[in-house]
């Protein structure tokens, strides 16, 4: 199936041009999207392309600029948030950060009503997470690990919390590892529907080992960076939540919220909050075995001043086959009762659907089902639930809209958005207004991405918000690859993969191979989505077919393929990556002396072991980033697939699942080793040992550090390694430069 | 000191409204929930219900739903209990009690009482 | 609702003897956090005094020779010495669930 078909034709040929790696490391082709800044039903906010804030009405069609491009620029502004009340409005600037979600920053409140900038008892600075109260304009900020309350913007703040400490005690945000893999957030604080109360959680990393790595900076010594990062098996974070009522914080003060007794006999997440109503409220804990997952809805007594959970409101979610949840647990979407809600996990046949629940989850109803995923609830209204999944046309990487009526019986099901721009767009998401009134529908592909707006009673398209007419103009005289998504079926296992090929790609030829890989549990590379990037380049510039694979351990096509790595990662995704080379190569048109294999981060984990399967398959391969032994990674994530590195445990597969272990399999493959020194996620320690193991087993490799660079390897940093990738390539291709 | 006091007994014959008041003092009256309970003679306790002056929640106890409307004045830091319909089984005294703060469902300061007769 | 059973009905001791009086709930009035049971005494004429908060705790002004104990569905009231001012009636209130439930009470008279 071609998705992006070629738009060659001979009469044009002398005007097209290949992509060049100038082209993508400039980001000439890079598209925009628009989602609207919701504050009600039927208006949204906009930063214009000139820097103004600018409120649109959708039902009167009328625009005003509610804050100049001046203002913002007397501040250096660079993000903003208006009060629920719209009478003030902070802005951001010296945004500083920190991990994937965290970042300090400077806020000035700027008064609407006067148009200045309010004054006594300003901010304090760097503030590390600031929001407004969903109702009128209280403000709660996390400075120095504790948390802060003010009734109004100009008033004196209220201190909620007094033992934040620097890598110690966190308030209202997330340590580093709850930040990056359970919350996937930088805050750790949730207001109640009408501000009435705010939640927080208190994260205590005492007796948390740290990871200590040198930044270089430009000083006679160098820094040493210390985060609290529990690897496999090591000392967790003591989590506690905590509400305080907003209206009277000093009555009785925080109240902390117990947790379900079967949660609280062993080590235990908690995984999310949501708000259900002012005075109650839904939590969600997990074992740090993570297997079983506690969702208890709490309520406010007000004779107790305090939360109460019974028991008969605590809904347990087991997996038998694998771990709780996808990546993670899924959230619960309240109905209009505020005691029923929806929920997507796993059904009776392993394929995750959304269900409802209104006593208990034995008792749950069953609301979409199929050998497909729903994969996001976007929003429930009194008579419709908007939720996306993968079922159209039974392709796992695509992802459509679609309404449920849940006011009328039986339900009704309606695909919004499958037919709106069928050859375009096939890849989804959504952002609902106010009672979804209103909804823009965002579309990444396979075309050219595209934003528009509708109506949420009828699904009528009001007008298109973005539609990248400038990156359609810049593309029209150049020569992309095609793509292809298509399927292998081996042995009951669907394979399915997207192959980009050169744009005057002819199947009677033989051209190189370059697998790129992912491959992490719970992740999806084969989707339906546009992009111009580094193997675009490859495919059209330097004639390689690239190919991206989804083997097992990969999302959205039920728990077979999912829990196929539970307990033993490093085995089937890399055996799948390797079946599909071979399916590849019995194509015909791939010169099997030239096929190499390349990821990032559990890509270059995967990448790394395939070359080192003793295949034979590979001429080399680059590794970016890898983890090299589960060991050295977050508890939280790897526990998650791997349970713990003890004897009685899963030790064995952890010391066999080393890149270390095959280190003598790397002799006969050319092998591009790549990491940041200053990688707070994947430490450089693993690269380090790689590296170590291999110069031990007297085995030769290539490899590039980036001083002072984190996993995302950003700046300069990209442009060197993506032009150092394709040197390795192309020598190991034998292509000329 | 905190202080609850109440209105003086009644007496009431069956089908008619009593309402009972309950002065506090001694506290910030719009901080503690204000509970009602019951003794009919030679009786046990019988919780009626409660009401916040602060928030103006209030909870009634299922058996009296629709009989009873507790209300507060909190100008005059006043909170009355209302009981219509009477018949002869509501003849006990009442008593108002303050909620103590951080004691989560006790009563730690009651008023005096006041007897309601229902007699014909 | 929370049925409130207290035993004995009726306990006859002489001043300086310990008393100890039961009181048992038809379902568990504890959480994690606190159990809630109050005990009250209660003389006649008179309005109902809080002796002791949430199981165990001492109500400011109460002398401590009160002492209260019990999770779950089973607390006791315990006086250590009876004085002769202690003979009264005395009554367990649970806050767990609403409605808000008293125990039928014990009372305590001289021997």
């Known amino acids: 199936i071609v998705l992006r078909p070629s738009r060659v034709h001979n009469s044009e040929e002398n005007t097209m041009r290949a992509l060049t790696l100038k082209d993508i490391l400039n980001g000439t082709f890079s598209y925009k999207t628009f989602f609207p800044n919701w504050i009600s039903g039927q208006e949204y906010l906009h930063q214009s392309a000139d820097n103004n804030i600018v409120l649109y009405n959708i039902e009167t069609g009328q625009s005003y600029t509610i804050l100049s491009n001046r203002t913002m620029k007397s501040v250096n502004a660079s993000n903003y948030g208006l009060s629920p009340d719209r009478q003030f409005v902070y802005l951001e600037s010296d945004y500083s950060k920190l991990w994937r979600y965290s970042y300090t920053a400077t806020y000035y409140i700027y008064d609407l009503s006067n148009g200045e900038f309010v004054r006594g008892n300003e901010l304090p600075r760097p503030i590390q997470y600031l929001c407004w109260s969903p109702v009128g304009s209280k403000l709660a900020y996390v400075y120095q690990n504790n948390i802060y309350l003010k009734q109004r913007p100009g008033d004196p703040p209220f201190q909620i919390t007094f033992n934040g400490r620097e890598n110690k005690i966190f308030n209202g945000i997330p340590d580093w590892v709850y930040e990056e893999e359970m919350l996937a957030t930088k805050y750790a604080l949730w207001w109640s529907p009408n501000g009435k109360f705010l939640a927080y959680a208190e994260f205590n990393d005492t007796d948390i080992p740290v990871i200590a790595y040198s930044y270089y900076g430009d000083e006679q010594y160098p820094r040493t960076i210390n985060i609290p990062y529990p690897k496999a098996g090591a000392k967790n974070p003591v989590v506690r939540i905590f509400i305080i009522d907003t209206t009277y914080p000093a009555y009785v003060g925080p109240q902390e919220v117990p947790v379900p007794a079967m949660i609280a006999s062993s080590d235990y997440y908690f995984s999310w909050l949501t708000w259900v109503t002012d005075e109650r409220v839904c939590l969600q804990w997990l074992k740090r075995v993570q297997n079983v997952s506690v969702l208890s809805i709490c309520d406010f007594r007000e004779d107790w001043q305090t939360w109460d959970c019974p028991k008969t409101q605590e809904h347990i979610e087991e997996s038998r086959t694998g771990w709780a949840g996808g990546f993670f647990v899924s959230t619960p979407v309240f109905s209009y009762d505020a005691i029923s809600y929806y929920k997507i996990f796993s059904d009776k046949d392993g394929y995750k659907h959304i269900h409802y629940i209104k006593d208990t989850v034995e008792n749950a109803i069953q609301i979409t089902s199929g050998k497909w995923e729903a994969i996001n609830i976007f929003r429930v209204t009194q008579d419709s639930l908007f939720y996306s999944s993968n079922e159209f046309e039974e392709y796992p990487g695509r992802r459509n809209i679609y309404r449920i009526s849940i006011g009328s019986y039986p339900p009704s099901k309606k695909c919004v958005t499958c037919h709106l721009r069928k050859e375009r767009c096939q890849y989804y998401t959504a952002s609902f207004s106010d009672y979804a009134k209103y909804y823009a529908l965002v579309c990444y592909g396979p075309g050219i991405p595209i934003s528009t707006l509708h109506d949420g009673r009828t699904d009528q398209e009001i007008k298109i918000l973005e539609e990248n007419k400038e990156l359609e103009n810049a593309l029209k005289n150049i020569q992309l690859p095609k793509e292809e998504i298509k399927k292998l079926e081996v042995d009951e296992i669907t394979l399915w993969y997207k192959m980009i090929l050169p744009p005057q790609f002819d199947r009677s030829k033989k051209y190189p191979l370059l697998i790129q890989v992912y491959g992490g549990p719970c992740s999806q590379s084969v989707r339906s989505v546009f992009a111009v990037n580094w193997i675009s380049y490859l495919a059209s510039k330097e004639g390689m077919v690239i190919a991206l694979v989804d083997g097992r351990g990969t999302a959205f096509q039920g728990d077979k393929l999912l829990y196929a790595v539970y307990r033993k990662l490093g085995v089937y995704e890399v055996e799948d990556q390797i079946t599909a080379v071979r399916k590849f190569i019995e194509m015909g048109f791939i010169d099997e002396k030239r096929i190499a294999i390349w990821g990032w981060s559990y890509g270059g984990y995967v990448s790394s072991l395939a070359l080192a399967s003793g295949t034979g398959l590979f001429k080399c391969g680059i590794a970016v980033a890898p983890v090299s032994s589960w060991e050295y990674y977050a508890s939280v994530y790897t526990e998650r697939f791997m349970g713990l590195p003890t004897k009685d445990d899963n030790l064995e597969h952890y010391k066999n699942s080393t890149v270390m272990a095959r280190a003598e399999y790397f002799r006969n493959v050319d092998y591009l080793l790549i990491h940041g020194t200053a990688d707070d996620n994947v430490h450089f320690q693993n690269s380090a040992q790689i590296a170590k193991a291999l110069v031990n087993a007297q085995v030769d490799f290539q490899a590039m550090w980036y001083s002072d660079q984190n996993h995302g390897l950003s700046g300069l940093s990209t442009n060197h390694l993506y032009t150092h990738m394709t040197h390795f390539l192309k020598q190991c291709f034998s292509l000329s430069d | 000191q905190v202080q609850l006091v109440q209105s003086g007994a009644e007496v009431k014959k069956p089908g008619a409204s009593v309402k009972v008041s309950c002065k506090a003092s001694g506290y910030t009256f719009t901080e503690n929930i204000i509970h009602w309970v019951r003794q009919a003679p030679g009786q046990g306790l019988e919780w009626m219900g409660w009401i916040h002056p602060g928030s103006g929640s209030i909870k009634y106890a299922q058996k009296l739903q629709g009989r009873v409307t507790m209300t507060t004045d909190t100008s005059t830091s006043t909170a009355y209990m209302e009981l219509r319909s009477l018949r002869s089984d509501d003849t006990a005294v009442y008593y108002c009690?303050?909620?103590?703060?951080?004691?989560?469902?006790?009563?730690?300061?009651w008023g005096q009482g006041t007897l309601v007769t229902v007699s014909s | 609702e929370i049925v409130l059973t207290q035993s004995p009905g009726t306990l006859s001791l002489s001043p300086g003897e310990r008393a100890t009086l039961s009181c048992r709930a038809s379902?568990?009035?504890?959480?994690?956090?606190?159990?809630?049971m109050h005990w009250y005494q209660q003389k006649p004429g008179q309005a109902p005094r809080l002796l002791i908060y949430l199981a165990s705790n001492l109500e400011s002004g109460i002398p401590d020779r009160f002492s209260g104990s019990g999770s779950g569905t089973d607390f006791t009231l315990t006086i250590s010495r009876l004085e002769p001012e202690d003979f009264a009636v005395y009554y367990c209130?649970?806050?767990?669930?609403?409605?808000?439930?008293f125990g039928q009470g014990t009372k305590l008279e001289i021997k």
């Open positions: 009690a303050r909620h103590g703060g951080t004691a989560r469902g006790a009563m730690d300061y």
């Open positions: 209130q649970q806050s767990r669930e609403l409605p808000y439930t």
């Open positions: 379902q568990s009035v504890s959480t994690s956090a606190y159990s809630y």
